[in-house]
Structure formats: C-alpha cells, structure tokens
C-alpha cells in the first residue's frame, strides 16, 4: 500500500477532531454506545485507523 497521510497533531489544544483534542463539538466517528465524552475517535478505543492516518511524515 502507498504510505500515507500526516496526522499533523497540533500542539495547542481545543481544536476538533484529533487524538486528545476530541471534544463535545466533534460530530463524527462516535459510537452510539459511547457518551459524548468518550469518542470512538480516541486512539485508546483500540480500533484501527485509516491508511490516511497511519504514518507521520
């Protein structure tokens, strides 16, 4: 497979969508069985990420 995608985790907190920055505003990748404070997007969920989010450049 083509190696892919920068995760580009920002250094400041408060944005939407990335690792420890997941907050109540993020509307995607949530499991219905989860509360809004424990998103399925959290890497600790153990789910496998897309090839786009696999590698840092």
């Amino acid at each position: 497979p083509i190696s892919a995608f920068a995760v580009d985790i920002p250094e400041t907190h408060g944005g939407e969508g990335y690792e420890d920055e997941i907050d109540d505003e993020y509307e995607g990748d949530w499991s219905n069985s989860s509360s809004s404070t424990s998103g399925a997007g959290d890497p600790s969920s153990g789910k496998e990420k897309s090839w786009l989010y696999t590698l840092d450049p």
């Epitope: 920068a6 939407e16 789910k47 496998e48 786009l52 450049p57």
Partner: antibody, heavy 116, light 107 residues
Amino acid sequence: EVKLVESGGGLVKPGGSLKLSCAASGFTFSSYAMSWVRQTPEKRLEWVASISRGSITYYPDSVKGRFTISRDNAGNILYLQMSSLRSEDTAMYYCAREYYYAMDYWGQGTSVTVSS
Amino acid sequence: DIQMTQSPSSLSASLGERVSLTCRASQDIGSRLNWLQQEPDGTIKRLIYATSSLDSGVPKRFSGSRSGSDYSLTISSLESEDFVDYYCLQYASSPYTFGGGTKLEIK
C-alpha cells in the same frame, strides 16, 4: 451541523478541464483531511483524491498527473482541478470529510459529463 | 489493490424482515471497513465504521459484524426508508476501495 456543498460540475469535451469546489461548514475545516470520491453512471464508487491538513496529496493511478486536489483553509473550500478529461471520468463527484475511520460526512455531489 | 466483493447486488425483502448484506475482502483489512447508505437522490451517509460501530443517529436496527474476511451489515427489521442502496468501503490500505453495492428493494 457538518455541511459539504459541491459545485462546478458540468459538460466538458474530452481533453478539457474543469474545477470542482466543495464549500465546508459546521466544523473546523483546517483540522480535517478531505477527499473526493466519484460515482460512475454504473453506480460504482471510486476514490479520486485525498489531501491532508498540511496539504499532502494522494491519488489513485487512474487520475494521477491529471487531477489536482487542493484546499483553502481560510475560505473553508476544497478543490479538485481536473484536466485531460476522458469519457471514463464522467461521474457524480462527492467531497467527503476524513477522520480516523475514513470518510464520515459526504456532500450531495456535483455531476461531471465528459462528451463530445 | 484490495478488492471488495459485495453480495447480493440486489435484494428483495419485506417490511419487518431481517436481512444481511456481505462484503468479502481479498486481503486482510482487520476491522477497517465502513458501511454507507445512499438515498435515491444521491445522498450518501455513513452507517457503520470500524466494522461494527454505529454512527451517531443511526437506528439500532442496523448492525455490523465480521467473520474472517467476510463483513456483514444486518438490518434486524426492515422499515420503509431502508429500501435504498448500500456500499462497503475498506480503508486499510491505499487506494480506498468500495464494494459494488447492494440495491435493497421492497417485495
């Protein structure tokens, strides 16, 4: 509410060019990777291009060198510049937001027809 | 490229019936599979991600599972709005590849 609205589709002759746009709202656009996917007249879905938050780009072999994905983080707009268009590029083109588990929100699509 | 073979291509079923759609991956993709729903007007919505996680707002009659290289979308009791098109998507490796789709029709 996450919203993605594509525009710019139309009828173009083989060998011609077209630029599609996708206006994003309801989320912090710069914080997400974005992709383009197309659906052929036979209803087959095909990945077209992806762009990272830092504007690193990815393409399948079928469009590499002909299509260019780009983004305007200030204006919350995703683009797809298509050139050297072929009849097989005829499709409905969708933009989609990316997250850990691939495309989580999709636009309504814009139609591209390549015909003489 | 990873090939996703989706079956059946069309399925006729009745309201209240339980149905399952399947995608078979040509290579190992782990749990990296989504199910998408497409309305007649072209609107595409993700129903399930990571094989079995339900997206927010998706009715609980939808569920996803895996057995080896076979991935299934099950609708426990069909409702009228479920008679649309469904696609699987693998995101394990580039390029993204999709199943050929299943058209769910009312009997």
